[in-house]
């Protein structure tokens, strides 16, 4: 039994880091493998993660952590019974994938303005809370070409757009994702999408 693709890990910079790897053949990850992880910290003790299957030869493990600070560094040991298959380390602050925003809501009752709001996925005491920026994706269910991205570079989790920038009388969907420049993170997953019917009053033409 050998590791074909070494574990790569990303942290949500809160409580979970996710590690994925591939074995050289079909593997029952949960029964055959264990990933031990330990904070490089005087008198810390190792924790065990039981991996799950992620495709035939792929494994994934969700490492539970007590918060994350920038100095954190973990040693990782992948075991198959008594055999050490791989040894490495992981610094969560250097591999951050933020949590996805939630509670995306489209408010259509503000005159002819669409107000999109969502929730910051982090509590106020987390470092990322004040460092997230967002991308909002809006698309038409009827027209695949009608697809747009709005970059929200301010901290407030909201976006206002004129309803007239979208076509009237058709349904749209929106979703939002987050990233943090301070840690050069990857983008989060997209939030669940929300749907609304776009309608607004066309302005009278002046003759």
């Amino acid at each position: 039994m050998k590791v074909l693709q070494e574990p790569t890990c990303v942290s949500d910079y809160m409580s979970i880091s996710t590690c994925e790897w591939k074995m050289n053949g079909p593997t029952n990850c949960s029964t055959e493998l264990r990933l031990l992880y330990q904070l490089v910290f005087l008198l810390s003790e190792a924790h065990t993660c039981i991996p799950e299957n992620n495709g035939g030869a792929g494994c994934v493990c969700h490492l539970l952590m007590d918060d994350v600070v920038s100095a954190d560094n973990y040693t990782l040991d992948l075991w198959a019974g008594q055999q050490l298959l791989w040894k490495g380390s992981f610094k969560p602050s250097e591999h951050v994938k933020p949590r996805a925003p939630g509670n995306l809501t489209v408010h259509t009752n503000v005159s002819d303005t669409l107000l999109l709001t969502w929730s910051n996925p982090y509590p106020p005491d987390n470092y990322l809370y004040n460092h997230l920026t967002y991308a909002v994706n809006i698309w038409s269910e009827n027209d695949p070409a009608d697809f747009r991205i709005y970059n929200v570079t301010y901290l407030e989790p909201s976006l206002r757009i004129a309803a007239s920038t979208l076509k009237s009388g058709i349904s749209y969907r929106a979703r939002v994702r987050a990233w943090a420049q301070c840690y050069n993170t990857t983008w989060s997953e997209w939030s669940p999408s929300t749907k609304w019917h776009n309608s607004y009053r066309e302005p009278f033409e002046q003759h």
Partner: antibody
């Protein structure tokens, strides 16, 4: 209420031995690494020794290595420091402290201290 | 072994003023954790800041920590009468624990 209560301090002659105890209440000792920190009269804080949650790993400052032994009895919620070959410079208030991994080495609970005096 | 040097040794200020206490490490400690403690006469120390900048439970927001590499700072934005005490920085690393020698904050 979370508390640590040290005992076992006293007057001892140079070369003598003493065993300090620390009784924990209000929390489960086995969930935390535990440490001893001391403070000589009128001086600053000095780290002495620590022990991991389960007791499998220990650490000692160079000044006490080979003379002091830290141990714990998790079922009894008690931490110990066995001190031998004591010297005058070991005279200090000894504090039992708790470290939370969440606090990354921050010592969030301290006992009131027990005084050890090494003198002839 | 890493040495932590605190400055100044004594700081004389009045209530309402801003206090800035320094802690310097003898080498880069970016892979370790810095904490700050307050100690009043006859009492055990109290944890104020951990992980360089995070306030411990129940610590007022006038206390803040910052820094990286070798230089760290504890700032008390507006001194209250109860803040006059001795302050210690502490480094908790992979292989050792070290305290600074302390800064005494006294009333001017």
């Amino acid at each position: 209420e979370v508390q640590l209560l040290e005992s076992g301090g006293g007057l001892v002659q140079p070369g003598g031995s003493l065993r300090l105890s620390c009784a924990a209440s209000g929390f489960t000792l086995s969930s935390y690494a535990m440490h001893w920190v001391r403070q000589a009269p009128g001086k600053g804080l000095e780290y002495v020794s620590g022990i991991s949650h389960s007791g499998t790993s220990t650490y000692y400052a160079n000044s006490v290595k080979g003379r002091f032994t830290i141990s714990r009895d998790n079922p009894k919620n008690t931490l110990f420091l066995q001190m031998s070959s004591l010297r005058a410079e070991d005279t200090a208030v000894y504090y039992c402290v708790r470290v939370r991994v969440l606090y990354r080495g921050g010592m969030d609970v301290w006992g009131q201290g027990t005084t050890v005096t090494v003198s002839s | 072994e890493i040495v932590l040097t605190q400055s100044p040794g004594t700081l004389s200020l009045s209530p309402g003023e801003r206090a800035t206490l320094s802690c310097r490490a003898s080498q880069d400690v970016s892979s370790a954790y810095l904490a700050w403690y307050q100690q009043k006469p006859g009492q055990a120390p109290r944890l104020l800041i951990y992980g360089t900048s995070r306030r411990a439970t129940g610590i007022p927001d006038r206390f803040s920590g910052s820094g990286s590499g070798t230089d760290f700072t504890l700032t008390i934005s507006r001194l209250e009468p109860e803040d006059f005490a001795v302050y210690y920085c502490q480094l908790y690393g992979a292989t050792s624990v070290t305290f600074g020698q302390g800064t005494k904050l006294e009333i001017k």
